[in-house]
């Protein structure tokens, strides 16, 4: 139990103001009422409290709200948010995007802390899905946010939210994540015309299957090498030399510089050398002329 000391005469806080910065820890405990603090949380941020004083204020709120803070208090926490533990945050029910933004602002410029990760998790779970506005907000503060989610979590992203995703938001996504996001992007952008569609879908192509790459090769898209290198190896391997040439357009010359790296290396090994020679790039490692290519995967499927 907390040691209780009476508030000295004349020190009882009637409002939350600058005079409180001169209070010792025990005086804050004895003289600041938690219910008063809760009603004036918006003032706390403007007062230069020490970390020790902020600890007392946090304990005051814990006293008032043992089952977790209400949103009316959470939205005004400001720097007091940095004092919260993930366990504290798990008790909250945050439904307002404005509240989320206010708290993310406090942590701006720092790595995503366990507190922020817990807050985002509570918020998204409360909403049931990652809607466009939420995704917009989260990726604005944390460009790598989307790629920090598991494929299972990404499955809750509705296609309409994909419009909020910027290319840089996908920089750290692995193929498993792009496998989930690509079909959603395809659905989201399906009504766009060829060139516009490609601009939007390009960042997601690391999750595209072979048949979609073949279709793109018929649309003069001129895919850059950076995008090509991020494609799924298993999606690239069945592409013919002619299809890759159409897919890359003028960028096809870049294959030479990448011939030792996947997926280019593996793709070269699957092509006939005389087909590769038609590119005039000096790509080596294809199947020598006169050799028979057996597709073992097809053989296994038939047997």
């Amino acid at each position: 139990e907390v040691e209780k000391t009476a508030c000295p005469s004349g020190k009882k806080a009637r409002e939350i103001d600058e005079s409180l910065i001169f209070y010792k820890k025990w005086e804050l405990e004895a003289c600041v009422d938690a219910a008063l603090l809760a009603t004036q949380m918006d003032r706390v941020n403007a007062i230069p409290f020490t970390y020790e004083q902020l600890d007392v204020l946090k304990h005051k709120l814990d006293e008032l709200y043992p089952q977790g803070y209400p949103e009316s208090v959470i939205q005004h926490l400001g720097y007091l948010f940095l004092k919260m533990s993930p366990e504290d945050i798990r008790k909250w029910n945050v439904t307002s995007l404005e509240t989320l933004k206010a708290l993310l602002e406090v942590n701006k410029g720092h790595e995503m802390s366990p507190q922020v990760a817990t807050l985002i998790d509570r918020f998204v779970k409360g909403r049931g899905q990652l809607d466009k506005d939420t995704l917009d907000t989260l990726t604005a503060f944390y460009p790598g946010y989307l790629c920090s989610l598991s494929p299972e979590e990404l499955s809750s992203v509705p296609p309409s939210s994909i419009w909020a995703v910027r290319p840089q938001d996908l920089d750290t996504c692995d193929p498993r994540q792009l496998d989930v996001l690509y079909p959603k992007a395809r659905l989201a952008f399906q009504n766009m015309n060829g060139s516009e569609y490609f601009v939007k879908i390009q960042s997601f192509l690391g999750g595209a299957p072979t048949e979609d790459l073949k279709a793109l090769s018929q649309q003069n898209v001129s895919m850059d090498l950076a995008t090509f290198m991020k494609l799924r190896t298993d999606a690239v391997l069945p592409l013919t030399v002619a299809e890759v040439q159409k897919l890359l357009g003028p960028h096809v010359e870049g294959l030479k510089a990448e011939e030792r790296h996947r997926p280019v290396r593996d793709w070269i090994l699957r092509q006939r050398q005389d087909d590769l020679d038609t590119l005039g790039l000096g790509l080596q490692g294809g199947i020598p002329n006169g050799y028979l290519v057996l597709d073992l995967s097809m053989q296994e499927a038939l047997s």
Epitope: V2, K4, C7, E29, A34, T39, H59, E63, P70
Partner: antibody
């Protein structure tokens, strides 16, 4: 079931003292703000005082400040109101009530105990 | 101190009629901190509405609260015989947590 039971009321002379008690049950007393509210005969409700659960921070109406002291014993789940220097205008039914911080309201009330200050 | 002024002082109505009770604050009160109570003769008050518009547990939906800033309203859509009582508003924004002086709803 939440229950609040006041006791300690009675007849007292002006200038005298009285201590009211409120026994609480059916909820986590150690987590809850508690209040006293009074009602003079035929009049409206008047908030008197409250006390926080952990730090026992107290607040009072100006009309009782310096004369009344609210306190609590969390081990006994009991709230107290020590009333000194009583005046005729303190005559009222005194209610003990639980303050629900999440609702910012008094959500459970005792049945009240009558304090009469008269010579 | 925040002063709450309730009007009218007395409201004479018949069962089945609509009752509209007003509570005006001397300064702005966040709706999160405004509550309404009902008190019948010889009984303790009972919480009806908290947060200006949320009904407390077990309160019939004929009771509703509204308002913000300095003006708040308690509405009883169709008066039942058991609704004739005194109604109080209270603010918990600043100390002291003041009550209004009450509105008596009596049978016409």
């Amino acid at each position: 079931e939440v229950q609040l039971l006041e006791s300690g009321g009675g007849l007292v002379q002006p200038g005298g003292s009285l201590r009211l008690s409120c026994a609480a049950s059916g909820f986590t007393f150690t987590h809850t703000y508690m209040s006293w509210v009074r009602q003079a005969p035929g009049k409206g409700l008047e908030w008197v005082s409250n006390i926080s659960p952990t730090y026992s921070t107290t607040n009072y109406a100006d009309s009782v400040k310096g004369r009344f002291t609210i306190s609590r014993d969390n081990n006994k789940n009991t709230l107290y109101l020590q009333m000194n220097s009583l005046r005729a205008e303190d005559t009222a039914v005194y209610y003990c009530a639980r303050y629900n911080a999440y609702h910012a309201a008094l959500d459970y009330w005792g049945q009240g105990t009558l304090v009469t200050v008269s010579s | 101190e925040i002063v709450l002024t309730q009007s009218p002082g007395t409201l004479s109505l018949s069962p089945g009629e609509r009752a509209t009770l007003s509570c005006r604050a001397s300064q702005s009160v966040s709706s999160s901190y405004l509550a309404w109570y009902q008190q019948k003769p010889g009984q303790a008050p009972r919480l009806l509405i908290y947060g200006a518009s949320s009904r407390a547990t077990g309160i019939p939906d004929r009771f509703s609260g509204s308002g913000s800033g300095t003006d708040f309203t308690l509405t009883i859509s169709r008066l039942e015989p058991e609704d004739f009582a005194v109604y109080y508003c209270q603010q918990a924004l600043g100390y002291p947590h003041t009550f209004g002086q009450g509105t008596k709803v009596e049978i016409k």
